[in-house]
């Protein structure tokens, strides 16, 4: 099994590891499947690409019957199988079988924290946000290891790229010192950013 690892939105080339001459194509059926679902077929020269892969998949017949998936999505991750059937005697027989495992990485960048003064009050508001990751993120605010209540946390997903964006607001009393951590967990991974508030200097120091 061949392993291919790519970043989301990148291009992945999955090779069948087999060549068929142009003359042989008329007597050949090629199936690319992903976890038992069809991706692409070429039957006696006629090519068909399944709807989920249309307009973003190229079949490179001259390069080991590779499929090239453009603008990778998280859902493209999985095991692909290429089957080459060759006509001999009175039936198509399996001439070649190959498996390629595709991993699609979609890491959230370190979140950014911005702060705003709320006029005529001792309350200051900070907003933590990041985008472009997968799977669905879970954001929490921590101070001294204790979880805090955010004002509102929004998680959205781009239907086209399947990537998530997350944003959360937290209000705090600016008359005392604070060290807040914005922690984002997604799958088995996590990213975080710390916001420090110092009352003496009336300024903040984000950790970079």
């Amino acid at each position: 099994v061949i392993h291919v690892t790519k970043e989301v939105k990148e291009v992945a080339t999955l090779s069948c590891g087999h060549n068929v001459s142009v003359e042989e194509l008329a007597q050949t059926r090629i199936y690319w499947q992903k976890e038992k679902k069809m991706v692409l077929t070429m039957m006696s020269g006629d090519m068909n690409i399944w709807p989920e892969y249309k307009n973003r998949t190229i079949f490179d017949i001259t390069n080991n019957l590779s499929i090239v998936i453009l603008a990778l999505r998280p859902s493209d991750e999985g095991t692909y199988e290429c089957v080459v059937l060759k006509y001999e005697k009175d039936a198509f027989k399996r001439e070649h079988l190959a498996e390629v495992t595709l991993s699609v990485k979609a890491d959230f960048p370190t979140p950014s924290i911005s702060d705003f003064e709320i006029p005529t009050s001792n309350i200051r508001r900070i907003i933590c946000s990041t985008s472009g990751g997968f799977p669905e993120p879970h954001l929490s605010w921590l101070e001294n290891g204790e979880e805090l209540n955010a004002i509102n946390t929004t998680v959205s997903q781009d239907p086209e790229t399947e990537l998530y964006a997350v944003s959360s607001k937290l209000d705090f009393n600016m008359t005392t010192n604070h060290s807040f951590m914005c922690l984002i967990k997604y799958g088995h991974l996590r990213v975080n950013q710390t916001f420090n508030w110092n009352t003496t200097k009336q300024e903040h120091f984000p950790d970079n």
Epitope: A26, K36, V83, Y87
Partner: antibody, heavy 116, light 108 residues
């Protein structure tokens, strides 16, 4: 000589399931994709799907996804098609056929009648 | 899905007549992926012509096929009583595989 022998006619009640078998002779199903085709009374031919018996991969016409389940047992060299949640409109003759440039070899057909 | 439209849906001709059945395909396919079958009542379909124009094993030479792209034809040069059957075209260009609705041929 290549032959495909199917199981006998079945009469089932609505909501029931039925499993039709297709036993080839003259070849081993492990080496060939096996297809199923349906023909309702007085109607045309409709392709249901195929199985690659070597690895169990299947492909269905979306119309039959969830209705038909195609399986194969390479130890007995037999292909099967199970139909679930039967309704009167599933009454038809079901054929198995072997993959080729075209369908050169067909089973004799199995009539499945759904009636209360 | 690729749609296959046969015409006529039925015909009646005399013994010795030349009979033509057409099959129109909704999108262009390779001629090697167009096949014809003959089905007699109560029997399984039998291959007649494969790859547009090649006669299947044991098929009499009065049957012939032609066409390309989206238009295909099955011809019986001299109709015989044993040709009474329903004829189907079928594409193997893309999944799901599809058949024409059938043309029933009868003797006058």
């Amino acid at each position: 000589e290549v032959q495909l022998v199917q199981s006998g006619a079945e009469v089932k009640k609505p909501g029931a399931s039925v499993k039709v078998s297709c036993k080839p002779s003259g070849f081993n199903i492990k080496d060939y994709y096996m297809h199923w085709v349906r023909q309702a009374p007085g109607q045309g031919l409709e392709w249901i799907g195929w199985i690659d018996p070597e690895n169990g991969n299947t492909l269905y016409d979306p119309k039959f996804q969830g209705k038909a389940t195609i399986t194969a047992d390479t130890s007995t060299s037999t292909a099967y098609m199970e139909l679930s949640s039967l309704r009167s409109e599933d009454t038809a003759v079901y054929y198995c056929a072997r993959e080729g440039l075209f369908f050169a070899y067909w089973g004799q057909g199995t009539l499945v009648t759904v009636s209360s | 899905d690729i749609q296959m439209t046969q015409s006529p849906s039925s015909l009646s001709a005399s013994v010795g007549d030349r009979v033509t059945i057409t099959c129109s395909v909704s999108s262009s396919i390779s001629s090697s992926n167009l096949h014809w079958y003959q089905q007699k009542p109560g029997k399984a379909p039998k291959p007649l012509i494969y790859g547009t124009s090649n006669l299947a094993s044991g098929v009499p030479s009065r049957f012939s096929g032609s066409g390309s792209g989206t238009d295909y034809t099955l011809t019986i040069s001299s109709l015989q009583p044993e040709d009474v059957a329903t004829y189907y075209c079928q594409q193997w260009s893309s999944y799901p595989l599809t058949f024409g609705q059938g043309t029933k041929v009868e003797i006058k």
